[in-house]
Amino acid sequence: TQNKALPENVKYGIVLDAGSSHTSLYIYKWPAEKENDTGVVHQVEECRVKGPGISKFVQKVNEIGIYLTDCMERAREVIPRSQHQETPVYLGATAGMRLLRMESEELADRVLDVVERSLSNYPFDFQGARIITGQEEGAYGWITINYLLGKFSQKTRWFSIVPYETNNQETFGALDLGGASTQVTFVPQNQTIESPDNALQFRLYGKDYNVYTHSFLCYGKDQALWQKLAKDIQVASNEILRDPCFHPGYKKVVNVSDLYKTPCTKRFEMTLPFQQFEIQGIGNYQQCHQSILELFNTSYCPYSQCAFNGIFLPPLQGDFGAFSAFYFVMKFLNLTSEKVSQEKVTEMMKNFCAKSWEAIKTSYAGVKEKYLSEYCFSGTYILSLLLQGYHFTADSWEHIHFIGKIQGSDAGWTLGYMLNLTNMIPAEQPLSTPLSHSTYV
């Protein structure tokens, strides 16, 4: 029955987010006659592709087709057959593929070519696979959350969509954390954006927005960990690395060749007298935090103020939605509540990191050890990035809202990407008055 045409006139769109650690497929749906209204597009399905990110298929491109099959078949089931041919499919690859392209355009092209051939075999309207820029990733994430929060709507609503939503038209900033990059995007308060590379101008629904955005390549949680390990092993006296970012009792062997595989560790590369080293966890939040801070160069700033590594950052303004790995990690650590202060978060992280690896494995028996082992690092990294990297304070911490979904749609760049490519965000306010959210929620 699922392939019967729906009585109402609806449209669908598919976006694949080819991230550094995994690929996710999102299916969106909207009423055809209300394409230009605000907030009408919503997510009906998310399918996480089993396996790593597409950049890991360099040596096995022939496996990409099988890798994508389950989620593409799921899309075939969810979307009525009568709609297949007119349903656009977009694949956007992010920082994992940016890093692969940095190493070799040929290898990145080869992966994307096979992805395109695989996706072209489905009955949908495939629109192409491409590596999106960090600026696009930041911008589309910002568009997504503000679209879902109703910030582009001219009507001030009498009710709130989500608990943390303020009932005004001030946009939310967007904080996105992936495996290989992190993005910060917001509208600064009447300050000129000193670096042209970080400035975006939008006209959406009749209103102009001057947006600041930056994508920090190599500062996603996975690449940040590789950077930290490469930095710390430089000063290790032997092939044992006593690491405060892992729980006491945790042990893992790392190949030096794996450590130097990524361009992110290039600045720390050196000839080591061993081919492998062993991480031995000592579980100390404060020391872990100090080690992470060494990844942020704050000694040089050619602007009035910077985040780190000489990158311009205007003073923070307004509320921020922190999503993707910001949310997943903090959710696991049970730290997403609006009521938890920054001091409390830090305290809980200290306690979490100090717990023995055996105790952690017992408490979270259902979680894969590879992921479980990295929550101490990831949580500490998030705090370091937000506080020292982006200059949030104990006071402004309350303006960070850890968001997984808004109105059932995942926060992330994919919805904004599709809205843009399908021309569903008009520059001017549509003549017909949009329905209030209450009509269709």
């Epitope: 360099v58 040596q59 491109v61 940016r98 392209r101 940095m102 190493e103 070799s104 355009e105 040929e106 290898l107 990145a108 092209d109 080869r110 820029t133 960090g134 600026q135 590379d197 390549l217 190599c218 361009p263 992110c264 560790t265 290039k266 600045r267 720390f268 590369e269």
Partner: antibody, heavy 116, light 111 residues
């Protein structure tokens, strides 16, 4: 449109150093490596090395290691190469080229003449 | 280091005819199913211009008369039909492994 604009010609004395620049525009500077290539006598092309603008890490052709230094200024989107202890053998055109493994965009070159 | 031997060192071809330049590598330049072989054209006073990447793919804006072929250690660049504007130096390059290396060059002229 991607462009690489290199600094002007240099006349330097033997034993001295030279520092040339390569200003990039039209793309995200930190998304691609910057390579440097030497061309002598209008014929022989030699790869010197590359820098990762993202973090300043570099890799060299052993022949130039220790004598060439590659740096970047990300805010001005500029890559630099300094060559030290110059001899007449270093008289050549030096090019910067953007790429991972594909040198699709090249600067116009900086001509270095080493002469007493 | 991978040595690239280009031949011939110079070549004169009549307009409309075929020019073939070959490049032999001292070891395979293939990896992960890709040939890391490139062909450049260089005219006097100009930087090299990418013609062919990945052994057989045409660079942006490169006319169809430039064709690259080969894999492993043996590669060739074919220009057909030869035009007056094709008078230039031609270089092959490998980027399979550091140090990246270039062939010695082929000077192509009109006969």
């Amino acid at each position: 449109e991607v462009q690489l604009q290199q600094s002007g010609p240099e006349l330097v004395k033997p034993g001295a150093s030279v520092k040339m620049s390569c200003k990039a525009s039209g793309y995200t500077f930190t998304d691609y490596n910057m390579h440097w290539v030497k061309q002598s006598h209008g014929r022989t092309l030699e790869w010197i090395g590359y820098i990762v603008p993202l973090n300043g890490g570099s890799t060299f052709n052993q022949k130039f290691k220790g004598r060439a230094t590659l740096t970047v200024n990300t805010s001005s989107r500029t890559a630099y190469m300094e060559l030290r202890s110059l001899t007449s053998e270093d008289s050549a055109a030096y090019y910067c080229a953007r790429g991972g493994t594909r040198f699709a965009y090249w600067g116009q070159g900086t001509l270095v003449t080493v002469s007493a | 280091d991978i040595v690239l031997t280009q031949s011939p060192a110079s070549l004169a071809v009549s307009l409309g005819q075929r020019a073939t330049i070959s490049c032999r590598a001292s070891e395979s330049v293939d990896n992960f199913g890709v040939s890391f072989m490139y062909w450049f054209q260089q005219k006097p006073g100009q930087p090299p211009n990418l013609l062919i990447y990945g052994a057989s793919n045409q660079g942006s804006g490169v006319p169809a008369r430039f064709r690259g072929s080969g894999s492993g250690t043996d590669f060739s660049l074919n220009i057909h039909p030869m035009e007056a504007d094709d008078t230039a130096m031609y270089f092959c390059q490998q980027t399979k492994e550091v140090p990246y290396t270039f062939g010695g060059g082929t000077k192509l002229e009109i006969k």
